[in-house]
């Protein structure tokens, strides 16, 4: 797994801890919580990232409606359970043996059960609606740089493809920020959709999961964008199943 | 050479804790993950935990949380595990080995729970 | 966590003969598994690290292979000074985990 050979350390997530004792006698970098070695030349899944998270805690409208399908996280942090691939399983427990089934990205897609809970699929989220309130400046900002400086953003600190950015729309002091990745357009080296929206939002709220790096420092023809609130609406390949038809929270 | 020192023995009334050591020496002692493994008598391996010198960083298996603690001194280069509340469960080896692949081992400390 | 099976617990060869030893894990963990070999009172060491890479000042005779779940340790000609126990070890992910050994005999 490729790190900073020099001074063996994982620029893409500072979660980690490396050593030279990898294949080869090369830097390895493992995530703190699971102990998986991690690609430091990409991002590190969400999964283990979270697992990381609590091992070191323990009319007009130009905006998009989200779907009455979407899932909105609100349940917060846990530990949960990663593949060998460091993805999401689809079942997940917390300690007291109350399980429930996620989505690609980890969020709650069903109602809480007992142990006796079957998940039969991880199920993708394919489509990720970032919602971000800026602060108020003296002027709206141009739509057409907005989109640009965003869709920098994604590409070169979060190493999405281009194509996986389907929209930025913005209404003052709205914006949002449309992902879209099916299954099958996903390439094996694609940075997934999950991963990307999960370090812009850690970048937002001060968190910068990289190593070493500033906070996130968006400007828009050099006006500073400064965030207020963010909301992050997940979209799955299939309906959640939750017992009372609502926009969930998940 | 990377050398893991480790003391031959200790006698403990059970009920008691012990504090095992292991000092390293021939290599940089920060930059690699140390391991304790447990070997009782005619017995296979059993991983114990790690901890990583350079940040405290630890890990357990589950079994040993609540027996075993493990901490490091940084000037001396030694690692240490405190094993607390012993019985004859405990009676074992307990070996130190370096870094993910375990390549370098210690000869094993020998505890013996006995009144 | 990830469990590792070996076998067979005890092989009996006789000096000269190819032996190879059996590891499975009960998920895919890479090329992340490392062979041990311990003898009577003495302390593990290693002989074959990421399944297949050999290690400084152990005879050549001993060789791994595998990937995912599934892992080999050979010896392609055994001698008296091989008899010991054998164990593979994961370190795919926390907690790191052993198999239970195969002992060596020879015949």
């Known amino acids: 797994h490729t790190a900073a050979q020099d001074n063996c350390t994982c620029p893409t997530n500072k979660m980690t801890v490396c050593s030279p004792d990898g294949p080869g006698g090369r830097c390895q970098c493992r995530a703190l919580g699971s102990g998986m070695a991690v690609d430091c030349s990409t991002l590190t899944s969400k999964c283990l990232l979270l697992k990381a998270r609590m091992s070191a805690r323990k009319s007009g409208r130009s905006l998009v409606m989200p779907s009455e399908h979407a899932i909105l996280d609100n349940d917060g942090l846990y530990d949960p359970e990663c593949d060998d691939k460091g993805r999401f399983k689809a079942r997940q427990c917390n300690q007291t043996s109350v399980c429930w089934c996620v989505n690609s990205v980890g969020v709650r897609r069903t109602d809480k059960g007992d142990q006796s809970l079957r998940c039969d699929e991880v199920v993708r989220t394919h489509h990720i609606l970032i919602e971000l309130r800026h602060r108020p400046t003296d002027r709206a900002f141009n739509h057409s740089d907005l989109d640009s400086e965003l869709r920098r953003l994604f590409q070169e600190r979060y190493k999405l493809h281009p194509s996986f950015l389907s929209a930025v729309h913005y209404e003052e002091p709205t914006i949002q920020i449309e992902l879209r990745q099916n299954a099958s357009q996903k390439g094996l080296r694609d940075v997934d959709i999950a991963d990307a929206a999960y370090y812009f939002e850690r970048d937002i709220k001060g968190e910068s999961l990289f190593m070493g790096r500033r906070g996130l420092d968006v400007q828009v023809r050099g006006e500073p964008l400064h965030v207020e609130r963010t909301l992050i609406y997940y979209l799955d390949e299939k309906p959640p199943q939750f017992s009372m038809k609502r926009l969930t929270a998940g | 050479q990377v050398q893991l020192q480790q003391p031959g023995s200790e006698l403990v009334r059970p009920g008691a804790s012990v504090k095992l050591s292991c000092k390293a020496s021939?290599?940089?002692?920060?930059?690699?993950?140390m391991h304790w493994v447990k070997q009782r008598h005619g017995q296979g391996l059993e991983w114990i935990g790690n901890i990583y010198p350079g940040g405290g960083y630890t890990n357990y298996d589950e079994k040993f949380k609540s027996k075993g603690t493990l901490t490091v001194d940084t000037s001396s280069s030694t690692a240490y595990m405190h094993l607390s509340s012993l019985t004859s469960e405990d009676s074992a080896v307990y070996y130190c080995?370096?870094?993910?692949?375990?390549?370098?081992w210690g000869q094993g400390t020998t505890l013996t729970v006995s009144s | 966590d990830i469990l590792l099976t070996q076998s067979p617990a005890i092989l009996s060869v006789s000096p000269g003969e190819r032996v190879s030893f059996s590891c499975r894990a009960s998920?895919?963990?890479?090329?992340?598994i490392h062979w041990f070999q311990q003898r009577t009172n003495g302390s593990p060491r290693l002989l074959i690290k990421?399944?297949?890479e050999s290690i400084s000042g152990i005879p050549s005779r001993f060789s791994g292979s595998g990937s995912g779940t599934d892992f080999t340790l050979s010896i392609n000609s055994v001698e008296s000074e091989d008899i010991a126990d054998y164990y593979c070890?994961?370190?795919?992910?926390?907690?790191?985990?052993f198999g239970s050994g195969t002992k060596l005999e020879i015949k």
């Open positions: 021939g290599y940089t002692f920060t930059s690699y993950w």
């Open positions: 998920q895919n963990i890479g090329t992340s």
């Open positions: 070890q994961q370190s795919n992910s926390w907690p790191f985990t």
């Open positions: 990421y399944a297949s």
């Open positions: 080995t370096r870094s993910s692949v375990f390549d370098y």
